[in-house]
């Protein structure tokens, strides 16, 4: 028997459910009492979910996985995981086993959105030309980390004096905070991408600072 | 200005191990990706890994998975790349690279040489 | 994890424009506007020309520029000069934050 599995990372959102695709041949004459199938966590063998002796032995991981029943005499092994969590990332392995058995292994990546930067200043009065402000880009509840970029109204990258820092919350998200030290000119606008590096999905925040008030 | 100076390549066994550094200089280091591109002999480049700005998120290239580590230490503004298992597809000049612009490799470091002999 | 297909060679006279693909599929140059592209001369570091599809970062001439179609990804170089002869490479963010560079083309002024 020859297991496939896609080659690609699967990329999963938080709170969402994923197919962990996983595929067999299976021969004329084929029927499921014949079938031992076992997903298991790649790296710990820890059991997620198996089918033997002719039917599921449900999940165990977390009740959160589920196969796909009428598809299996057709060689459907795949795995759904319902409600995604940062923790639920990393590599599966599929085993298929009929007279003869094989493995493979899928990788489940998960993501999760980046909020629009919201941006503020300090000092946020009285500014002229020459005074050193700091600028603070902030953006909330993504995953993995950002990267984060800075640029002058002229789209000039600016990489001096940006202190970036990125704390994880209790669902393993990331809150991240971008600060820029900059001197300022007679006017200027400041941005910030915000960049999340799986889903190429980018946010972006600026601030203008002129003689009137700020605009954001 | 910017800087990265790679060091730790040299003539290795098949199978044996190696670490390069990339030391930086000139930007805040703990702020950005960095990542490992590599170079056979009059060939082309190959990306290897690239590792977040605290280290948290690593990812690599399939022809290293299992077999290389990237790794750094914010404190030193230091870059690594562990090589284990190394195989003769491996020797390369291996270079460091910052990604202080979006999507892209900015800075280059001047690229270490890793011999892996048969 | 396949490497984006670029022309081995492409060459031009002085003051001339020529232009180098890049082509990959939906899940690497189709799929994001991260495309960069880098030039290296012979023993040398790679020196990036553009980013982002079309941006230059400072220091780099306006005589480079890119663009981008479907899967297909260029960079152009207008007003060619002996300077310019060395290897280029595009590169493109893939799936799952991995990367993938082009095969490479090396430009010959004539």
């Known amino acids: 028997v020859e297991v496939q599995v896609s080659e690609d990372p699967v990329v999963a959102l938080v709170d969402t459910d994923a197919t962990l695709r996983c595929s067999f041949s299976p021969e004329p004459g084929f029927s499921l009492a014949q079938l031992n199938l076992i997903w298991q966590l790649t790296d710990t063998k820890q059991l997620v979910h198996s089918f033997t002796e002719g039917r599921d032995q449900g999940s165990a991981y977390s009740n959160r996985t589920a196969l796909f029943p009428d598809l299996l005499v057709q060689g459907n092994a795949s795995l759904r995981l319902q409600r995604v969590r940062v923790t639920d990332e990393g590599s599966y392995t599929c085993f298929v086993s009929i007279q003869d058995f094989d493995s493979a292994a899928v990788s489940l990546q998960v993501a999760a959105p980046y909020s629009k930067p919201s941006m503020t200043l300090e000092p946020n009065k009285d500014l002229r030309p020459g005074n050193m402000v700091t600028i603070t880009c902030s953006s909330y509840q993504g995953y993995p980390e950002a990267e984060v970029f800075w640029k002058d109204g002229q789209g000039v990258p600016l990489t001096g004096n940006v202190t970036t820092s990125q704390m994880a919350n209790e669902r393993g998200l990331f809150d991240v905070h971008s600060v820029l030290r900059v001197v300022l000119g007679a006017n200027g606008t400041y941005s910030c991408l915000v960049r999340n590096p799986v889903l190429q999905q980018d946010a972006h925040g600026s601030v203008t600072i002129t003689g009137q008030p700020l605009t954001f | 200005q910017v800087q990265l100076v790679e060091s730790g390549g040299g003539l290795v066994q098949s199978g044996g191990s190696l670490r390069l550094s990339c030391a930086a200089s000139?930007?805040?280091?703990?702020?950005?990706?960095m990542s490992w591109v590599r170079q056979a002999p009059g060939k082309g480049l190959e990306w290897v890994s690239v590792?977040?700005?605290?280290?948290?998120?690593?990812y690599y290239a399939d022809s290293v998975k299992g077999r290389f580590t990237i790794s750094r230490d914010n404190s030193k503004n230091t870059l690594y790349l562990q090589m284990n298992s190394l195989r003769a597809e491996d020797t390369a000049v291996y270079y460091c690279?910052?990604?202080?612009?979006?999507?892209?490799?900015?800075?280059w470091g001047q690229g270490t040489l890793v011999t892996v002999s048969s | 994890q396949s490497a984006l297909t670029q022309p081995a060679s492409v060459s031009g006279s002085p003051g001339q424009s020529i232009t180098i693909s890049c082509t990959g599929t939906?899940?690497?140059?189709?799929?994001?506007?991260?495309v960069s592209w880098y030039q290296q001369h012979p023993g040398k570091a790679p020196k990036l020309m553009i980013y982002?599809?079309?941006n230059r970062p400072s220091g780099v001439s306006y005589r480079f520029s890119g663009s981008k179609s479907g899967n297909t990804a260029s960079l152009t170089i207008s007003g060619l000069q002996a300077e310019d002869e060395a290897d280029y490479y595009c590169?493109?963010?893939?799936?799952?934050?991995?990367?993938?560079f082009g095969t490479g083309t090396k430009v010959t002024v004539l």
């Open positions: 690279a910052s990604h202080t612009i979006p999507g892209a490799w900015d800075v």
């Open positions: 000139g930007f805040t280091f703990s702020s950005y990706a």
């Open positions: 590792i977040s700005g605290s280290g948290g998120s690593r």
């Open positions: 939906t899940r690497d140059v189709g799929g994001y506007n991260y």
């Open positions: 982002d599809v079309n």
């Open positions: 590169s493109s963010y893939t799936t799952s934050s991995r990367r993938v």
